[in-house]
Interface confidence: low
């Protein structure tokens, strides 16, 4: 008789794939445009990335550092109207993309929470949650919560409002903190909160250190659902050496939890990489005409258009990973086990019941290495086979689908491998 299938866990929509942050509507759409109506035209692109949610804004009226001139219920006319927003919600819904609204109050100002008027701001947030939930948004984000006095109790209250409306609504909080104790204390009082932080960016970017960061985080947060990113709002390129970008994409998509990216992460967009570009909001490089004032500043391989046509590009890797993440049970909600491997490597397995299993091997080092996989650390339920099929490599030159002998596995410098193997009873 076949063994009984393991009961599937309850899956919320944000468990099923990545979130995509667009913090600056104008920079995302490029020079000379940047409103909600224009964003509607980019939803097909977001669909092609297979992201499950769009974290948008802030979009509300905010005069720098002026509480009286900050209205969380009103969309800043520069971004469009409430009608434009409603249309965007409808269009996103048709494409199965959820919309999360950033309500960080003083986003144009010095202290994002108007430090001297916390209580009146908190009341405004409460009213705004109810207003925008009625309008049909799927969740909210608030950032810089380390600057919000009594953050835990406010977050608990806001989560109650959000979840009270529907269990299918999400609250995301962002912090600049990379301190695990601070992060855990914020999470303790909020059972379903998704927290983005700088935790992973406070790293020496070695395999050993990354492994210990990930395992400490998972141990400290218990069995709650995590999110993975390198910061609450920034681009991956601002925190990572260029040669590790692909490796981190593979890792973020295959760790247990929700990967969270910022617009441009999928093409390796850099803050202030181009002449004449403001540092704080790099313009999304859709094609070579993204910088009309500076001929030749943008080459095809930096753009969405150029990378879409190149199967070896970062964008193609992102799409492949996002696709795997959204359809494979073991990556969606599988168990996670790390095990010993060569110096500079971080290796782990994702598995769920009798579904296909995935092995991830990441070489953070700048030398080629034997994987040296030591399965003795693994529980019996997650043992390693002798061979596994290559799903993808972060480097060119390997044939996808080819079987690799795990005992003889060698990795190139900064190479990450995603391998699959079947469950064997």
């Amino acid at each position: 008789r076949a063994p009984r299938c393991r009961e599937l866990p309850a899956q919320k929509w944000w468990h099923t794939g990545a979130l995509y942050r667009i913090g600056d509507l104008q920079a995302f759409q490029g020079h000379g445009s940047g409103n909600l109506a224009g964003l509607k035209g980019r939803l097909d692109y977001l669909s092609s990335l297979k992201v499950k949610g769009l974290v948008l804004g802030p979009l509300h009226k905010n005069q720098k550092d002026d509480v009286a001139q900050t209205d969380l219920l009103q969309i800043d006319p520069n971004f469009g109207s409430k009608e434009d927003f409603d249309n965007l919600l409808q269009s996103a819904k048709k494409k199965s993309i959820r919309v999360i609204l950033d309500l960080t109050p003083n986003y144009r100002g010095e202290n994002l929470w108007f430090s001297t008027q916390v209580d009146s701001v908190a009341t405004k947030v409460k009213d705004a949650l109810e207003f925008w939930l009625q309008a049909g948004v799927d969740g909210f984000q608030v950032r810089d919560i380390e600057n919000l006095k009594d953050a835990s109790s406010f977050l608990a209250e806001w989560e109650n409002i959000t979840k009270g409306f529907s269990e299918d609504r999400l609250l995301i909080a962002g912090t600049n903190s990379s301190d695990l104790q601070q992060i855990v204390s914020l999470l303790e009082s909020n059972k379903d909160l998704l927290l983005t932080s700088s935790y992973l960016s406070d790293s020496s970017f070695t395999g050993e250190h990354t492994k210990s960061l990930v395992t400490q985080y998972l141990n400290a947060t218990g069995n709650r659902w995590c999110s993975w990113s390198l910061s609450q709002a920034g681009l991956l390129t601002s925190f990572l050496p260029a040669q590790l970008l692909r490796l981190y994409q593979l890792m973020l998509f295959t760790l247990p939890g929700t990967p969270v990216f910022s617009y441009g992460d999928e093409i390796g967009l850099k803050a202030a990489a181009l002449p004449g570009q403001p540092v704080e909001a790099p313009v999304m490089l859709w094609d070579e005409s993204s910088f009309p004032d500076i001929p030749g500043a943008v080459s095809a391989n930096m753009t969405v258009k150029g990378q879409s046509e190149d199967p070896g590009s970062l964008l193609s890797l992102f799409r492949q990973l996002s696709d795997q993440r959204s359809k494979e049970r073991s990556l969606l909600h599988g168990d996670f086990h790390t095990f010993s491997s060569g110096p500079g490597l971080f290796s782990y397995i994702r598995h769920w019941d009798q579904n296909e299993r995935f092995l991830v091997v990441l070489n953070f080092g700048d030398v080629g290495l034997s994987a040296g996989l030591q399965a003795s650390d693994l529980p019996a339920s997650a043992s390693l086979p002798t061979k596994a099929d290559l799903v993808l490599s972060t480097q060119p030159g390997r044939e996808e689908g080819s079987p690799l002998e795990l005992e003889r596995l060698k990795l190139e410098p900064h190479e990450g491998l995603l391998l699959r193997f079947p469950y064997v009873a």
Partner: antibody, heavy 125, light 113 residues
Framework: QVQLVQSGAEVKKPGASVKVSCKAS????????MHWVRQAPGQGLEWMGL????????SYAQKFQGRVTMTRDTSTSTVYMELSSLRSEDTAVYYC??????????????????WGQGTLVTVSS | DIVMTQSPDSLAVSLGERATINCKSS????????????LAWYQQKPGQPPKLLIY???TRESGVPDRFSGSGSGTDFTLTFSSLQAEDVAVYYC?????????FGPGTKVDIK
């Protein structure tokens, strides 16, 4: 209130290195870029580079590339600027200055406020 | 790199008189997407670090007297003193923060006539 306090004056020989510190207080250290600007005697202001204290990433002016290193210590809220292979024309007052305001750790508007009190570095044989 | 130039190099004005300093950038520092000019003005007195007066080309920093005002867009900017005071004697610099490397004008020395 927001304050930047720099280390004291230094006298160095040509070819040597100097490391200037800048201790920040009164705000969340990792939330703002820190810049270094220098001013030779009787001259104007020259931007040297910036460090993002959150991740430690840096951006240097081409002129100083290869000679300057900016680092930070988040436990003491201090940034450091080290300039190597010193020559007499590096004699200047070196200032640290915080980015005017930041919406996130990678989203800063880079006017400079406040400034440190300045550190005079004299390079002389 | 964006090159900043200032004129005049120096000027002497009577107390209470109006004065203007000009600043020009070699390329536009107006960012179309948010319609903001990425330009700041600073005041520096002898032996002191520079002090921020104006950012976004025309927004006065809090605590800065309203006799200081900034204007202009694109590549041409002006710092205006509506009524010069003795404590305004200093060197004034403009700075672009549109793109790296961030650059300053050479400075304008303001004295009392």
């Amino acid at each position: 209130q927001v304050q930047l306090v720099q280390s004291g004056a230094e006298v160095k020989k040509p070819g040597a290195s100097v490391k200037v510190s800048c201790k920040a207080s009164g705000y969340t250290f990792t939330s703002y870029y820190m810049h270094w600007v220098r001013q030779a005697p009787g001259q104007g202001l020259e931007w040297m580079g910036l460090i993002n204290p959150s991740g430690g990433s840096t951006s240097y002016a081409q002129k100083f590339q290869g000679r300057v290193t900016m680092t930070r210590d988040t436990s003491t809220s201090t940034v450091y600027m080290e300039l190597s292979s010193l020559r007499s024309e590096d004699t200047a007052v070196y200032y640290c200055a915080r980015a005017g305001y930041c919406r996130s750790t990678t989203s800063c508007f880079n006017w400079f406020d406040p400034w440190g009190q300045g550190t005079l570095v004299t390079v002389s044989s | 790199d964006i090159v900043m130039t200032q004129s005049p190099d120096s000027l002497a004005v009577s107390l209470g008189e109006r004065a203007t300093i000009n600043c020009k950038s070699s390329q536009s520092v107006l960012y179309n997407s948010n319609n903001k000019n990425y330009l700041a003005w600073y005041q520096q007195k002898p032996g002191q670090p520079p002090k921020l007066l104006i950012y976004w080309a025309s927004t006065r920093e809090s605590g800065v007297p309203d006799r200081f005002s900034g204007s202009g867009s694109g590549t041409d900017f002006t710092l205006t003193f509506s009524s010069l005071q003795a404590e305004d004697v200093a060197v004034y610099y403009c700075q672009q923060y549109y793109s790296t490397p961030f650059t300053f004008g050479p400075g304008t020395k303001v004295d009392i006539k």
